[in-house]
């Protein structure tokens, strides 16, 4: 019996508008009806929560209104989008999946996605 596996891309480049999207996919060892997905940022040895959402299988993924994340779910796959990123937010973003219900609980953690964010160059003043 293998432990739950979580897959996510190794590297993602954020758009010039500071938006990064990636897929988090998990192989479920049980028949979960309630799943929690958390995005964590690891910098040095510090881990901070970026956003989290709980969803019922077959239903949409809903983050809090003030969250910088949005997402959609399809089976054991979650499409995550993080917005409002700046160059200083470059780092390793880890997808954590928890099968919350029914018992037993299971934990799965991806290896992380390195998100690179490059701040856009300011537009030069144009002389007319």
């Amino acid at each position: 019996c293998k432990a739950m596996h979580v897959a996510q891309p190794a590297v993602v480049l954020a758009s010039s508008r500071g938006i990064a999207s990636f897929v988090c996919e998990y192989a479920s060892p049980g028949k979960a009806t309630e799943v929690r997905v958390t995005v964590l940022r690891q910098a040095d040895s510090q881990v901070t929560e970026v956003c989290a959402a709980t969803y019922m299988m077959g239903n949409e993924l809903t983050f809090l209104d003030d969250s910088i994340c949005t997402g959609t779910s399809s089976g054991n796959q979650v499409n995550l989008t993080i917005q409002g990123l700046r160059a200083m937010d470059t780092g390793l973003y880890i997808c954590k999946v928890e099968l919350m219900y029914p018992p037993p609980y299971y934990l799965g953690i991806g290896n992380g996605t390195q998100i690179y964010v490059i701040d856009p160059e300011p537009c030069p003043d144009s002389d007319f």
Epitope: R36, L40, K96, Y101, P104, Y105, L107
Partner: antibody, heavy 119, light 107 residues
């Protein structure tokens, strides 16, 4: 700094009830799974229960299922363990512990509170 | 439920000895394995998390290895303050079981 302080332990007769509390400080309480772990005199560590984040999901060891209830008040940063129908085998030091945000290990523990079930 | 076994259950060693404790899970738990040290009358103290990561402030003589079902805690050179009981624990699935413990005492 992170602190966990248990209270509510004591001597109680079999069949009676007791409620333990764990006051947490120094971290964002609602972002963490919170656990109770116990240790009977001269024995090893036994996981008792966990309550997740907003308090909607709880899991229990078979030995306490149906008798113990774990709860939390995120507005008060407090974890609880309601223990009903207590038995002699529930005699133990009860610890609250914070599960790590990433892999769930117990990096922080309370000092423990002793529950003695005796007639 | 995932069962955790530890060996040996106790061992006698001298200061400076290299000590190895093994922990086995009844099914794969990936790397969600933690090691704790406990001294009489005290709360447990985390030593190693995620099988091989050293907790901040823990001396480097402690190390952990393994994944899947088989794990090891090694103390490279036993110090007087290391005489204690050591527990492994899995944080992969509920119930979050502990091993029965290994008591390390003075030879």
């Amino acid at each position: 700094q992170v602190q966990l302080v248990e209270s509510g332990g004591g001597v109680v007769q079999p069949g009676r009830s007791l409620r333990l509390s764990c006051a947490a400080s120094g971290f964002t309480f609602s972002s963490y799974g919170m656990h109770w772990v116990r240790q009977a005199p001269g024995k090893g560590l036994e996981w008792v229960a966990v309550i997740w984040y907003d308090g909607n999901n709880k899991h229990y060891a078979d030995s306490v299922k149906g008798r113990f209830t774990i709860s939390r008040d995120n507005s008060k940063n407090t974890l609880y363990l309601q223990m009903n129908s207590l038995r002699a085998e529930d005699t133990a030091v009860y610890y609250c512990a914070r599960g790590d945000m990433l892999t769930g290990y117990y990096g922080y523990w309370g000092q423990g509170t002793l529950v003695a079930v005796s007639s | 439920d995932i069962q955790m076994t530890q060996s040996p259950s106790s061992l006698s060693a001298s200061v400076g000895d290299r000590v190895t404790i093994t922990c086995r899970a009844s099914q794969s738990i990936s790397s969600y394995l933690n090691w704790y040290q406990q001294k009489p009358g005290k709360a447990p103290k985390l030593l190693i998390y995620a099988a091989s990561s050293l907790q901040s402030g823990v001396p480097s003589r402690f190390s952990g290895s393994g994944s899947g079902t088989d794990f090891t805690l090694t103390i490279s050179s036993l110090q007087p303050e290391d005489f204690a009981t050591y527990y492994c624990q899995q944080s992969y699935s509920t119930p979050f079981t502990f091993g029965p413990g290994t008591k390390v005492d003075i030879k």
